[in-house]
């Protein structure tokens, strides 16, 4: 056969679907690889062909579109399963071609099982709610296109295993779940089960997402440097190890990049000749506020090193701050014999 532009196996689009539920999978060619859509391609006389490779097999085979009740069908650039079976797992390829043009891409499809509490190997999207922020909501994801707007589905929401009914601060409103107050206790997995009729059959769509309650932007502050501070002086003798921690608190801010760095005499440690090491650790509060600690370490400090300026810097979307460490050379105590001699008036 003639050459075909092969985009390979698109593992970035690892598609997971639940067993025994409808699934509609769009050919990724039009979404991520080609500059034109299906309608344009179809108008230009291009044909979309689907085939697949079963799990643990190498043989590409055509998809059987003649199954009872049209269990697998194709509509425009969408491959439909009504419903999926466990052994539909495999690598699926969609190929767009005519006599002069060919382009194809493969993607993995995994059909996963869930238990009665909706636990499964499915990778869950995370939705962040601000703590104590006012009315916020989550929406049942990825259900568009499964039924026409004339069909009114029933939607049931669960937190973990429990149906949300009289949940006090959480109100089910069809496709939306409204949180009158978002609290730490609302952290967890929320599942919407959408039930709709089609051609005399009843189908269920199960969608689970993780809710994480995070710090409110109203409470967010610029970075706070807890250490170094004015109360601690790093007093060392030459030859000793100098350890200075820089500990910074960052309020949670959506999509903010939190940074901590040291400068020594105004330069980054990498840009100077001192043998300095910096170790970083990060911890998070329950609302994803972040504490970063960078420990600056000089194994054998020199008297020159003890005269340098050591400044900890921090930056977030809320602002930038800096704090200098108080470093000084320890004044050696007078030797005991000299002290005695002086005491007795020796010259």
């Amino acid at each position: 056969s003639e050459r075909c532009d092969d985009w390979g196996l698109d593992t970035m689009r690892q598609i997971q679907v639940f067993e025994d539920e409808p699934a509609r999978i769009k050919c990724p060619l039009f979404e991520h690889f080609l500059k034109f859509n299906y309608s344009t391609a179809h108008s230009a006389g291009l044909t979309l062909i689907w085939y697949w490779t079963r799990q643990d097999r190498d043989l590409e085979e055509p998809i059987n579109f003649r199954l009872p009740e049209n269990r697998i069908s194709k509509e425009k650039d969408v491959l439909w399963f009504r419903p999926t079976l466990l052994n539909d797992t495999g690598n699926y390829t969609c190929m767009l071609r005519n006599t002069t043009y060919c382009s194809k891409v493969a993607f993995p499809l995994e059909v996963v099982q869930k238990d009665s509490c909706f636990n499964s190997p499915m990778k869950l999207p995370v939705h962040k709610l601000y703590i104590e922020y006012g009315i916020q909501r989550i929406t049942c994801p990825n259900v568009d296109g499964y039924f026409p707007s004339s069909v009114k589905p029933t939607i049931t929401w669960y937190m973990g295993c429990y149906k949300i009914q009289n949940f006090n601060n959480v109100i089910p409103e069809g496709m939306n779940l409204s949180f009158l107050i978002a609290l730490i206790s609302n952290n967890g997995n929320y599942t919407c089960v959408v039930t709709y009729p089609e051609n005399g059959r009843t189908f269920h769509l199960t969608r689970t997402l993780t809710v994480k309650v995070v710090g409110s932007p109203k409470n967010a502050v610029p970075p706070v440097i807890h250490s170094p501070n004015d109360h601690v002086v790093y007093e060392k003798e030459p030859g000793e190890e100098l350890l200075i921690p820089c500990t910074v608190y960052f309020s949670f801010l959506m999509d903010s990049r939190n940074e901590v760095w040291w400068t020594i005499d105004g330069k980054k440690p990498d840009d100077i000749t001192i043998d300095v090491t910096i170790n970083e650790s990060i911890s998070h509060s329950r609302t994803e506020d972040e504490t970063r600690t960078q420990i600056l370490s000089i194994k054998k400090v020199t008297s020159e090193d003890l005269k340098r300026s050591y400044v900890c810097h921090a930056r977030s979307a809320k602002g930038e701050v800096a704090k200098a460490a108080k470093v000084k050379q320890k004044v050696p105590a007078p030797r005991y014999t000299v002290e005695l001699a002086c005491g007795f008036g020796a010259t």
Partner: antibody, heavy 122, light 110 residues
Framework: EVQLEESGGDLVQPGGSLRLSCAAS?????????MCWVRQAPGKGLEWVSC?????????YYASWAKGRFTISRDNSKNTLYLQMNSLRAEDTAVYFC?????????????WGQGTLVTVSS | DIQMTQSPSSLSASVGDRVTITCQAS??????LAWYQQKPGQAPKLLIY???LLASGVPSRFSGSGSGTDFTLTISSLQPEDFATYYC????????????FGQGTKVVIK
């Protein structure tokens, strides 16, 4: 005793302004509650005006007709709710009630004040 | 905006009667419905919230039902102190958050 007490109602000319207050006692404004204003014209039914979240965000919600003319606010340190009313019209004449909404109890409006009368007339 | 329509606007009943008031929302409000009782010169008093939950201290003769757009308040055996005006109140939290009241139902002595 847990209660709400409105004040600030008065006779005001059309086009004038007025600020209503609602002092809470027996409970603290906190992230559990929303505080709201509802009005009732003489001999008429209840009409929702506005709500504010008592938590740090202070998110506000208005009836479409109240947007722009009315402003809800609160001072948690004083445990007081306010309604600033501008460009007043004759049809704003009503008893104005403040109410507490318990966000931890399915949004129930569980506590109401006795109301303050606002009369807009020339 | 959501509109709440109550019926009837008034009704005459006797002590001991079973009374039913209905409330219809202009859009799906799920279970976001409350019922209030108001007596002349007084503030409204919460009876039912979340469509069917009885508020604290409210006698069990009051009950609420319904979801979506159609709701009902039932007083199983009318008592003398129940003669008052009753309001339904709907809420929508998703989308544009808003609350709205029905126009009221006045229950008078027959």
């Amino acid at each position: 005793e847990v209660q709400l007490e409105e004040s600030g109602g008065d006779l005001v000319q059309p086009g004038g302004s007025l600020r209503l207050s609602c002092a809470a006692s027996g409970f603290s404004f906190s992230s559990t509650y929303y505080m709201c204003w509802v009005r009732q014209a003489p001999g008429k039914g209840l009409e929702w005006v506005s709500c504010i979240y008592a938590g740090s965000s202070g998110s506000t919600y208005y009836a479409s007709w109240a947007k722009g003319r009315f402003t809800i606010s609160r001072d948690n340190s004083k445990n007081t709710l306010y309604l600033q009313m501008n460009s007043l019209r004759a049809e704003d004449t009503a008893v104005y009630f403040c109410a507490r909404v318990d966000g931890s109890s399915s949004g129930s409006w569980d506590l109401w004040g006795q109301g303050t009368l606002v009369t807009v007339s020339s | 905006d959501i509109q709440m329509t109550q019926s009837p606007s008034s009704l005459s009943a006797s002590v001991g009667d079973r009374v039913t008031i209905t409330c219809q929302a202009s859009q799906n409000i799920y279970s976001n419905l409350a019922w209030y009782q108001q007596k002349p010169g007084q503030a409204p008093k919460l009876l039912i919230y979340a469509a069917s939950l009885l508020a604290s201290g409210v006698p069990s003769r009051f009950s609420g039902s319904g979801s979506g757009t159609d709701f009902t308040l039932t007083i199983s055996s009318l008592q003398p102190e129940d003669f008052a005006t009753y309001y339904c109140q709907g809420a929508v939290y998703s989308g544009n958050t808003e609350w709205a009241f029905g126009q009221g139902t006045k229950v008078v002595i027959k």
